[in-house]
């Protein structure tokens, strides 16, 4: 089938005192092979500081996945979600505290 690029969505939620969990979700993509990871100051975080969801079908012929990590509140601007799919790549910032959703569709 033809390539379908992912929609990438970054959200944040309170984790504990002084910490937040940031989640990067990629959805609606095909084929299923994708790279999704968190970077700090442009450098990938270690594997054990990130939690990945499985790449699963969404029932519409495309796939979805996610990656999350916990960061210190106030350091959001240092973190980006890196996505690579079918030769295309992009980075996605953490939304500021008063905005909880960022959506980007990549072509």
């Amino acid at each position: 089938g033809s390539t379908v690029p992912p929609m990438v969505n970054v959200t944040r939620s309170e984790a504990s005192e002084g910490n937040i969990t940031v989640t990067c979700r990629a959805s609606g993509f095909y084929p299923w092979n994708i790279t999704l990871s968190w970077r700090q100051d442009g450098v990938s975080l270690s594997h054990d500081t990130q939690q990945w969801g499985d790449v699963l079908p969404d029932g519409n012929g495309t796939y979805q996945t996610w990656v999350a990590t916990r960061i210190c509140q106030g350091e959001e601007q240092r973190f980006t979600c890196y996505m690579e799919h079918s030769g295309n790549h992009s980075t996605h910032p953490v939304p500021s505290g008063n905005s909880h959703h960022h959506h980007h569709h990549h072509h």
Partner: antibody, heavy 122, light 112 residues
Framework: QGQMQQSGAELVKPGASVKLSCKTS????????ISWLKQKPGQSLEWIAW????????SYNQKFRDKAQLTVDTSSRTAYMQLSSLTTEDSAIYYC???????????????WGRGTLVTVSA | DVLMTQTPLSLPVSLGDQASISCRSS???????????LEWYLQKPGQSPKLLIY???NRFSGVPDRFSGSGSGTDFTLKISRVEAEDLGVYYC?????????FGGGTKVEIK
């Protein structure tokens, strides 16, 4: 973990249809894959299908493709399964179960409803 | 369809014993995403099944550490290190890697 409240027992006639509901609370509905399963008394379980609440996309066991239809209503946080052209072979307990996609578990049926007994009898 | 075969059908135990249930799949059950969705459930009479183990060996939250899962390829095992009264019931293995997802026939763990 949240709740999954299934509708009450149904007694239906052969050839009729029935719509079962699974009302949820206590978790983000759209983040879940909701599956429906069938169990006849004293027997093992059969997976019927799943529906992803976030998009309404679904995947069916071919055996049940013409028997079951899954839908979700995000506004009421409810999943439905309609069973059609019922025969006595469809008499069973039907369970809904969920997989929280953004939770920590990679299990398909982490949380279950209590089941709905469907009896097909003339 | 992937056939899941459980043995034994019935497993009489004494409380405190170790119990072992085997599950064999008719083909390899590695998902295209490289995960193995082999799960174990316990169903007590009149209740819904409850998840014990997912992805072969991961204990679900709240499941006692006397339960352990292992295996690979087509052969999988659930072990209960010291059976307690609350462990009695029917155990099912399940594969969620290949559609249609399928369950084993069940193993009834009961008192000797």
């Amino acid at each position: 973990q949240g709740q999954m409240q299934q509708s009450g027992a149904e007694l239906v006639k052969p050839g009729a249809s029935v719509k079962l509901s699974c009302k949820t609370s206590g978790f983000t509905f759209s983040d879940n894959y909701i599956s429906w399963l069938k169990q006849k008394p004293g027997q093992s379980l059969e997976w019927i299908a799943w529906i992803y609440a976030g998009t309404g996309g679904s995947s069916y066991n071919q055996k049940f493709r013409d028997k079951a239809q899954l839908t979700v209503d995000t506004s009421s946080r409810t999943a439905y399964m309609q069973l059609s052209s019922l025969t006595t072979e469809d008499s069973a307990i039907y369970y809904c179960a969920r997989h929280d996609y953004y939770g920590t578990s990679g299990a398909w049926f982490a949380y279950w409803g209590r089941g709905t007994l469907v009896t097909v009898s003339a | 369809d992937v056939l899941m075969t459980q043995t034994p059908l019935s497993l009489p135990v004494s409380l405190g014993d170790q119990a072992s249930i085997s599950c064999r799949s008719s083909q390899h059950i590695v998902h295209s995403n490289e995960n193995t969705y082999l799960e174990w459930y316990l169903q007590k009479p009149g209740q819904s099944p409850k998840l014990l183990i997912y992805k072969v060996s991961n204990r679900f939250s709240g499941v006692p550490d006397r339960f352990s899962g292992s295996g690979s390829g087509t052969d999988f095992t659930l072990k209960i290190s010291r059976v307690e009264a609350e462990d009695l019931g029917v155990y099912y293995c399940f594969q969620g890697s290949h559609v249609p997802w399928t369950f084993g026939g069940g193993t009834k763990v009961e008192i000797k």
